[in-house]
């Protein structure tokens, strides 16, 4: 875009402590508004500054100021992500497991020097408290992961920041917003039991304990019913079952019945990130000539 030789606004800057976006006004203008990351905007106070409520000191954000008349706009990034290109942590991922544990892992940046050290900070969506990594996973002394055993500070959406330090050069940071529902890996269902009568078998199980507060309606299950001692390549019976107040599946299976096994896995119905399978539970007789389920 063409540069204005006599811009009405110069020296656009963020006063971080006051959370004010401010500037120098070089001539009369009719109206000024500030735009944050093209997400929301606000009118300026007396055309001299914009008062923000919660600016991030870590998350790089575009702040644009635009003037009604004469039409003009200018912008800054705050904070700037300074440091050598390629030094930031990469391949960052996190997962919640066993309902109350979380692991995050990352790799060192390709141009990061040997003495690089990374630090993880997590802030919840309310931005009230910052969690510093309590237990780092290391590779040759460099932090490449983090283990958390207390997730009480997290909310449904959280901001993850990996800062870096080095005595040699500036290290760029990596940041990411993650939804807890997308990163939780469920445990398999527990207390799986099979009870059979002369004509049917009833499988029951308990929904896994999760970090998220979920109702039975949020779960989807898959049952793998497998006949033992069959030829390799024989298809398993995969059954999809929606979560219910009483998790159960009743299927016809008349006596005498061959030996079968059943295992179950669980997922969030919205995400379908399947858990690992539960331990296989066996039922039926060892006699290979008996009928199938």
């Amino acid at each position: 875009t063409k540069e204005d030789p006599n811009p009405p606004i110069t020296n656009l800057r963020m006063k971080a402590k006051a959370q004010q976006l401010t500037w120098d006004l070089n001539r009369n203008v009719t109206d000024i508004e500030c735009v944050k990351d093209a997400d929301y905007s606000m009118p300026a106070v007396n055309n001299s500054y914009c008062q923000f409520g919660a600016i991030s000191l870590c998350e790089v954000t575009n702040y644009t100021v635009r003037v009604a008349n004469p039409p003009f706009s200018t912008w800054i990034l705050f904070p700037e992500n300074s440091g050598r290109e390629g030094t930031a942590a990469q391949n960052f991922s996190c997962f919640i497991y066993n309902a109350d544990l979380m692991n995050c892992t990352w790799a060192r940046g390709p141009t990061a020097p040997r003495d690089v050290q990374y630090f993880l900070y997590i802030r919840n969506s309310k931005r009230r408290r910052e969690i510093r990594c309590p237990y780092y996973i290391q590779d040759s002394g460099t932090h490449v992961g983090c283990h958390l055993d207390n997730l009480s500070g997290l909310t449904s959406r959280n901001y993850f920041l990996v800062n870096g330090t080095s005595r040699e050069i500036g290290i760029q940071f990596f940041d990411s917003l993650l939804d807890t529902k997308k990163i939780e890996r469920f445990n398999p269902p527990s207390n799986v039991t099979v009870r059979c009568n002369t004509t049917h078998c009833l499988v029951r199980w308990k929904q896994p304990r999760t970090y998220q507060k979920l109702s039975y309606l949020d779960f989807q299950y898959q049952l793998d019913v497998h006949r033992k001692n069959t030829q390799p390549g024989t298809e398993n019976l995969l059954i999809n079952v929606s979560g219910d107040l009483e998790n159960r599946y009743n299927f016809p299976s008349s006596e005498p019945r061959a030996k079968h096994s059943v295992k179950i896995r669980a997922a969030d119905v919205r995400i379908l990130n399947w858990s690992s399978w539960s331990e296989a539970i066996e039922f039926g007789s060892d006699d290979g000539n008996l009928g199938s389920v």
């Epitope: 009719t30 997400d39 606000m42 008349n69 039409p71």
Partner: antibody, heavy 120, light 113 residues
Framework: EVQLQQSGPELVKPGASVKMSCKAS????????MKWVKQSHGKSLEWIGD????????FYNQKFKGKATLTVDRSSSTAYMHLNSLTSEDSAVYYC?????????????WGQGTLVTVSA | DFVMTQSPSSLTVTAGEKVTMSCKSS????????????LTWYLQKPGQPPKLLIY???TRESGVPDRFTGSGSGTDFTLTISSVQAEDLAVYYC?????????FGGGTKLEIK
């Protein structure tokens, strides 16, 4: 007298793109923002985005980022909007508008609208 | 996004009557810095583009008859037509002018008996 003259109706196939124009007269083209608004049939209005004619700086409603591209030709005082990957959801009347002296976000003057119909 | 809700969706009145219509915002449109409410009203007559009517909740655009009055503050706003004329047949839209993406209400359709 401020006038915004928009190009005629367009009938396009799904997946195609369209570029409509808006010729401004009666004022200094570079002194105001050019703004675009969508009105689906029998529905309300949606702001698409703005452009500063003097330097081409653009501001988009996130919903239309990637869908609409705004440009200007200062020599002919004409603003353009290009819409891509059209679907039936894009069938609507599109208005070009001019900002107000007092505030960039007010739609002070309106063109007559360009009807876009997306149909196989 | 700011959600703008207008009511009623339509109303029918006799010429000469007083009419009021409501617009509610999901968030406050009051700028504490200048005590202005960033709420704008537009009207759209049949077969025409919309037209700016009132800005800053209560300031009439030049050329707008004084029978049109805007009022309200924060999240609740009202447009009043003191004595409806036949030419006021239109759809009236309110608009959040405080913040991106400048959302409009669904409109109130005014019909004349």
């Amino acid at each position: 007298e401020v006038q915004l003259q928009q190009s005629g109706p367009e009938l396009v196939k799904p997946g195609a793109s369209v570029k409509m124009s808006c010729k401004a007269s009666g004022y200094t083209f570079t002194d105001y923002y050019m703004k675009w608004v969508k009105q689906s049939h029998g529905k309300s209005l949606e702001w698409i985005g703005d452009i500063i004619p003097s330097n081409g700086a653009t501001f988009y409603n996130q919903k239309f980022k990637g869908k609409a591209t705004l440009t200007v030709d200062r020599s002919s005082s004409t603003a353009y909007m290009h819409l891509n990957s059209l679907t039936s959801e894009d069938s609507a009347v599109y208005y070009c508008t001019r900002s107000h002296l007092l505030r960039a976000s007010w739609f002070a003057y309106w063109g007559q609208g360009t009807l876009v119909t997306v149909s196989a | 996004d700011f959600v703008m809700t207008q009511s009623p969706s339509s109303l029918t009145v006799t010429a000469g009557e007083k009419v009021t219509m409501s617009c509610k915002s999901s968030q406050s449109l009051l700028n504490s810095g200048n005590q202005k409410n960033y709420l704008t009203w537009y009207l759209q007559k049949p077969g025409q583009p919309p037209k700016l009517l009132i800005y800053w909740a209560s300031t009439r655009e030049s050329g707008v008859p004084d029978r049109f009055t805007g009022s309200g503050s924060g999240t609740d706003f009202t447009l009043t037509i003191s004595s409806v004329q036949a030419e006021d047949l239109a759809v009236y839209y309110c608009q959040n002018d405080y913040s991106y993406p400048y959302t409009f209400g669904g409109g109130t359709k005014l019909e004349i008996k």
